[in-house]
Structure formats: structure tokens, C-alpha cells
Interface confidence: low
């Protein structure tokens, strides 16, 4: 049972997870809903959402992004390449979602749900993917040092990082959702 969840509340034992496209679609929309709540708290707490210095901070974060070569856009769509990109991207986001865990006061529950729901989404997608060999898993040591580095930033940078992670994760999921609907 994931930390912070009651055993009765994770998939409520009797409700079997479905791995159909519809289920994946719903899982993503559920996560996006959680992100929406987290973004509300972030934007209410600081002025990061209107900040013009975003680009500078963004360069220091290696947040996953969809590019033309990933095959997820309508032009040059490639199901296998795209699926690999989505899974790889989500795996890369996991360290950033871990970072978000102590970043919220009133939305602590939501932050945990977003993190755990993403883990489940990855599992769903891995079942769907045929070419699992092409999926590179982030190095745990690298992730651990990245997490330490992010947590050592000053308050302003931490707020900025939180905002950027949420914004990028939302965009990545929205792109993933559009692509998965074509599969």
C-alpha cells in the first residue's frame, strides 16, 4: 500500500483496474484534475504564475517535453515511438513529483494522489507498450542528488521550481492525452 493511503482506498480492492484506452484516458484526466488544484494553491501563494523570469529558471530544470521527433504530434505521428516517449517522460517526472511532496500545505493529500496516480498510469502504459527495451529508467543515484539539489534551493527558487514542474507536467500530460487518443 503506497504511503499516505489507506489499503481500502487504493483501487478499493474490489474495483479492478482496467488497462483499456478509456481507463488510461480517465487516469490522465484524474491526474490533471489534481494538478489543477495544486496549481491553484501555488498561484495563490506566490506570484510565480505571472513571473517573467520563468525561462531562466526553466533552463536549470531538465523537465521532459514533447518534441517533433517523439512522434506524438499529429504530423509525423508514430505510435510506438510516442508511447516510449510518454513512459520515459513520466518516469523522468517521478523525481520532480517526489520533490512536490513537501511543497504543499492545504493540498498535501492532492500532491500524494498525483504522485501515486502517476505511478499507476506508468504501469498501465507499460502494459500497453510492446517495445519495453527502448524505455530508459532514470538512474536512482542521479535522481537522489537532483532531489537534494532542488531541496537546497532558496525559497524563491523552490516556489519557481514548483510552479514550473506543475506547468510542465500539465503540458506533458495534455500532449500525452491527445496522442494516446490517436492510438
Amino acid at each position: 500500500v503506497p504511503p499516505g493511503e489507506d489499503s481500502k482506498d487504493v483501487a478499493a480492492p474490489h474495483r479492478q483496474p482496467l488497462t483499456s484506452s478509456e481507463r488510461i484516458d480517465k487516469q490522465i484526466r484524474y491526474i490533471l484534475d489534481g494538478i489543477s488544484a495544486l496549481r491553484k494553491e501555488t498561484c495563490n501563494k506566490s506570484n510565480m504564475c505571472e513571473s517573467s523570469k520563468e525561462a531562466l529558471a526553466e533552463n536549470n530544470l531538465n523537465l521532459p517535453k514533447m518534441a517533433e521527433k517523439d512522434g506524438c504530434f499529429q504530423s509525423g505521428f508514430n505510435e510506438e515511438t510516442c508511447l516510449v516517449k510518454i513512459i520515459t517522460g513520466l518516469l523522468e517526472f517521478e523525481v520532480y513529483l517526489e520533490y512536490l511532496q513537501n511543497r504543499f500545505e492545504s493540498s498535501e493529500e492532492q500532491a500524494r494522489a498525483v504522485q501515486m496516480s502517476t505511478k499507476v498510469l506508468i504501469q498501465f502504459l507499460q502494459k500497453k507498450a510492446k517495445n519495453l527495451d527502448a524505455i530508459t529508467t532514470p538512474d536512482p543515484t542521479t535522481n537522489a542528488s537532483l532531489l537534494t539539489k532542488l531541496q537546497a534551493q532558496n525559497q524563491w527558487l523552490q516556489d519557481m521550481t514548483t510552479h514550473l514542474i506543475l506547468r510542465s507536467f500539465k503540458e506533458f500530460l495534455q500532449s500525452s492525452l491527445r496522442a494516446l487518443r490517436q492510438m
Epitope: 483501487a11 478509456e22 481507463r23
Partner: antibody
Framework: QVQLVESGGGLVQPGGSLRLSCAAS????????MTWVRQAPGKGLEWVSS????????AYADSVKGRFTISRDNAKNTLYLQMNKLKSEDTAVYYC????????????????WGQGTQVTVSS | DIVMTQTPSSLSASLGDRVTITCQAS??????LSWYQQKPGQTPKLLIY???RLQTGVPARFSGSGSGTSFTLTISGLEAEDLATYYC?????????FGSGTRL
């Protein structure tokens, strides 16, 4: 165990207002979508309104749109239904139900229902 | 809006019979359909979700099938305790909608 307890029903005149509450316990309320369903005397079930878990996004049946407002207080584990401009056709038992949610978003289906609260609109 | 047409509106059957209730959606709803049982004077109870998944504690004589626009609830070997009204619900897109019910 999971429990949903509705309250706030009663007799009200046409054009009047009522606020229904649903106290939830036994599960992580904030992680679930919640829904109100009603049943008029001797009639079938009618979906009334649903609310998303986190963002609070909402949806309504055409028959209540503009008159009813669904809301939730995740800190109090409570779901609400504010009913304004009530009509005689709103007379029904109102059920609070748990919709999809948890960490693994499974197939929908209202797996838990409250006992219902009676709303009667009559002059 | 999606309209759910449930048939028949009522049916009589004998104990041990195989009973079939159908729900037709006005447009494709994939497998986003659940079935509920409501016994007289009681609250509704979830039987089937995801068109064919049996809810915990529901006897195996109940089964659901279908996808797209056509769905079926089957009770194989009717028992006295199955006397109830049965409803389907599409939860594919808002506004969600119930079928009109089948009184057994």
C-alpha cells in the same frame, strides 16, 4: 467502513431553497468524485450533479442547471447541494453517492450510496 | 446528450429462469456502463461496472456484457431475492444518464 449520511431535506414551497449535506467517512474523501442522484416518488433514478475530486469542476443535469449548485469541503469531508428556485418536480429522495476515484482510477460506478434525504416541494 | 433506452420496462419470470435486460445507448459509450439493483424500500446497489465487471459480493449469477451502444444484464438462475428494479447508467460523458428501469 465507508459511510455517506445525507441531511437537510424537508418540505419547502415552490420557489424556495434548501441545502443538502452529505457527510462522508471511511475513505479519503478528497480523492473521489462525488455525485447526487435523485428518485421521484414511484419513478426511476435520475443523475443530478457530479463534482471532481480536486479542482471542484462540476456538471449538472439539464433539469437542474442554473438552479442547483454542487460543492464540496474536502477539509470537512462533506458534499453539498444548494437547491434554489425549487419546483414541484424536484420532489424526490436525494442520494449522495461516491463516484470514481482513489489512486487507481477504475471503471465508474457508484459503489456507495447514502440512505437518502426526502425533499418535498409543495404549497 | 446520451439517451439510454432500457428494455423491457417490466418482466415476469419464474425462479431458476435466465433473465436478460438490455440497455441501448444513443451513441457509443465504450464500456462506460454500470448496472444497479434496487429492492423495494432500499437504496440502489451497484452490481456491474465497466459493462462486465462484477462488484464484490454480488452473486456470480449476475453478468454484464456489451460495448459501444448495446449492453445486456443477465441473471442466470433467478432467485427470489432478485425481485427488484434494475437500472443501467452511462458514465461515459456528462450529463450522465440512467435507463428508465426494468421491474422484475
Amino acid at each position: 467502513q465507508v459511510q455517506l449520511v445525507e441531511s437537510g431535506g424537508g418540505l419547502v414551497q415552490p420557489g424556495g431553497s434548501l441545502r443538502l449535506s452529505c457527510a462522508a467517512s471511511g475513505f479519503t474523501f478528497s480523492n473521489y468524485y462525488m455525485t447526487w442522484v435523485r428518485q421521484a416518488p414511484g419513478k426511476g433514478l435520475e443523475w443530478v450533479s457530479s463534482i471532481y475530486s480536486f479542482s471542484g469542476d462540476t456538471a449538472y443535469a439539464d433539469s437542474v442547471k442554473g438552479r442547483f449548485t454542487i460543492s464540496r469541503d474536502n477539509a470537512k469531508n462533506t458534499l453539498y447541494l444548494q437547491m434554489n428556485k425549487l419546483k414541484s418536480e424536484d420532489t424526490a429522495v436525494y442520494y449522495c453517492t461516491r463516484d470514481l476515484g482513489g489512486v487507481v482510477v477504475t471503471a465508474n460506478g457508484y459503489d456507495y450510496w447514502g440512505q437518502g434525504t426526502q425533499v418535498t416541494v409543495s404549497s | 446528450d446520451i439517451v439510454m433506452t432500457q428494455t423491457p420496462s417490466s418482466l415476469s419470470a419464474s425462479l431458476g429462469d435466465r433473465v436478460t435486460i438490455t440497455c441501448q445507448a444513443s451513441q457509443s459509450i465504450s464500456t462506460e456502463l454500470s448496472w444497479y439493483q434496487q429492492k423495494p424500500g432500499q437504496t440502489p446497489k451497484l452490481l456491474i461496472y465497466g459493462a462486465s465487471r462484477l462488484q464484490t459480493g454480488v452473486p456470480a449469477r449476475f453478468s454484464g456484457s456489451g460495448s459501444g451502444t448495446s449492453f445486456t444484464l443477465t441473471i442466470s438462475g433467478l432467485e427470489a431475492e432478485d425481485l427488484a428494479t434494475y437500472y443501467c447508467l452511462q458514465d461515459y460523458s456528462w450529463p450522465y444518464s440512467f435507463g428508465s428501469g426494468t421491474r422484475l
